[in-house]
């Protein structure tokens, strides 16, 4: 007998993170075999989109010619085959950016820091908000994510840094969003470059449009060292 | 620096296969979207396939059914296979990685590529 | 599948004129779109991507613009070094189709 029919690939063009109102393409690569494709959305009525496959069989395409807070969530495709319907892939997660406006980024003391002091970024937004992300350009994904212990919403967060190195320095951006849907965030922040003087190492930034965040997962964020802000949020690793 | 190598033969005949290996350095091919591209001699820019790191694939459909773009993650390299050549299939053949996403700009466009090797297709 | 044509496809300008090059596609993309500098002889180089922001290192004359269908490539002030031909790419969706170029020379 034979096994389970292998689980496809499932990935998003151009990427899984878009801005509102852009497009985006939903690919699921299966087998030559496959004669129909079916992609599920997490809290939605399955299936969510069924497509037959594109020559030469082994790959459908499911398309969202503009972004919105409908389309935000985790993914999964299957396809069936004479003998049946696969595993299911891998999860995708499709984040939405520009769900809320953005919020103020902001250094204390001040952004330029000297290697071994202490410096926090302060994420700051108009309306108050249970979840802040701090992510920095290069890493592939957000360095901190804090959330209310309690479902409290806040107006900030606070991410500590200490003792800075020169690793630390490079450009930041925050982002706010709720908790009922991790899948929604808002608009970036401006960017804030974080310069760290005294190092052995050059601790000239790079220009902000030169940084370059990877497409997949197994760049590792860079991790700031500190203690847990006294914010009433507590810091989750991602 | 990341940076991108073509290699290959340079001549091949009528009806063969034309096989080529872009070998990724200073950086890791497990991320982003790897492509190859040609250009004939005097003419454009023509995209003749992706392979995704998960070895996820999309080519160009006037290419497709001879097309096989392959990634070999323990050698960083990714390879081109073009069967059924002919002498249309002459030009330099350029690998290139279209780059990641910026949270404040977006999507790159391909920010690095090979310098390029050129394939003849001849008897 | 989703054509990229570019127009004109070649121009001759003076040194220090503005220079536009336009490229249209036959339907959305969105902000999908880099375009492309390539000299006499040598590799493509990215000059913008996201429609509008120019890649590192490269000059502040050259600006693009554009979202959907319709995307400009400007070059403020055309200096000698710039004579090269210029592609446009989609990347919203396979297949990432290019523009046929435009060749730009100087007057």
């Known amino acids: 007998q034979a096994g389970p029919l292998p689980k496809p690939t499932l990935w998003a063009e151009p990427g899984s993170v878009i801005s509102w109102g852009n497009s985006v393409t939903i690919w699921c690569q299966g087998t030559l075999e496959a004669r129909e494709y079916r992609l599920d959305k997490e809290e939605s009525p399955a299936p969510w989109d069924r497509q037959n496959p594109l020559e030469p069989k082994n790959k459908a395409r499911f398309s969202i010619p503009s972004m919105t807070e409908d389309y935000a969530g985790r993914y999964r495709c299957y396809y069936r085959s004479p003998v049946g319907w696969s595993q299911p892939s891998d999860p995708l997660e499709l984040v939405m950016t520009g769900a809320y406006s953005k919020p103020t980024l902001s250094a204390l003391p001040s952004p330029l820091v000297t290697s071994g002091k202490s410096v926090t970024l302060l994420c700051q937004s108009r309306s108050p908000m249970d979840t802040f992300l701090l992510i920095k350009e290069r890493a592939a994904h957000p360095l901190l994510h804090l959330r209310s212990e309690h479902g409290a919403q806040q107006h900030q967060a606070e991410f500590p840094m200490s003792p800075v190195t020169s690793v630390h320095g490079g450009t930041y951006r925050c982002f706010s969003s709720h908790g009922f849907s991790h899948y929604l965030l808002s608009h970036p922040s401006d960017p804030l470059e974080l310069i760290v003087s005294g190092s052995l190492e050059d601790p000239r930034p790079s220009p902000t449009r030169s940084v370059s965040t990877a497409a997949g997962p197994e760049d590792q964020p860079l991790m700031p060292t500190g203690s847990v802000p006294h914010s009433g949020l507590r810091r989750h690793w991602e | 620096q990341v940076q991108l190598q073509e290699s290959g033969p340079g001549l091949v005949k009528p009806s063969e296969t034309l096989s080529l290996t872009c070998t990724v350095s200073g950086g890791s091919i497990s991320s982003y979207f790897w492509s190859w591209i040609r250009q004939p001699p005097g003419k454009g820019l023509e995209w003749i396939g992706y392979?995704?790191?998960?070895?996820?694939?999309n080519y160009n459909p006037s290419l497709k059914s001879r097309v096989t773009i392959s990634v070999d993650t323990s050698k960083n390299q990714f390879s081109l296979k073009l069967s059924s050549v002919t002498a249309a299939d002459t030009a330099v053949y350029y690998c290139?990685?279209?780059?990641?996403?910026?949270?404040?700009?977006?999507?790159?466009?391909?920010?690095?590529w090979g310098q390029g090797t050129t394939v003849t297709v001849s008897s | 599948d989703i054509q990229m044509t570019q127009s004109p496809s070649s121009l001759s300008a003076s040194v220090g004129d503005r220079v536009t090059i336009t490229c249209r596609a036959s339907q959305g993309i969105s902000n999908y779109l880099a375009w492309y500098q390539q000299k006499p002889g040598k590799v493509p180089k990215l000059l913008i991507y996201?429609?509008?922001t120019l890649q590192s290192g490269v000059p502040s004359r050259f600006s693009g613009s554009g979202s959907g269908t319709d995307f400009t490539l400007t070059i403020s002030s055309l200096q000698p070094e710039d004579v090269a031909t210029y592609y446009c790419q989609k990347y919203n969706s396979a297949p990432w189709t290019f523009g046929q170029g435009t060749k730009l020379e100087i007057k």
């Open positions: 392979i995704y790191y998960s070895g996820s694939t």
């Open positions: 290139a990685r279209r780059g990641g996403y910026s949270y404040g700009y977006g999507y790159y466009g391909m920010d690095v």
């Open positions: 996201a429609a509008s």
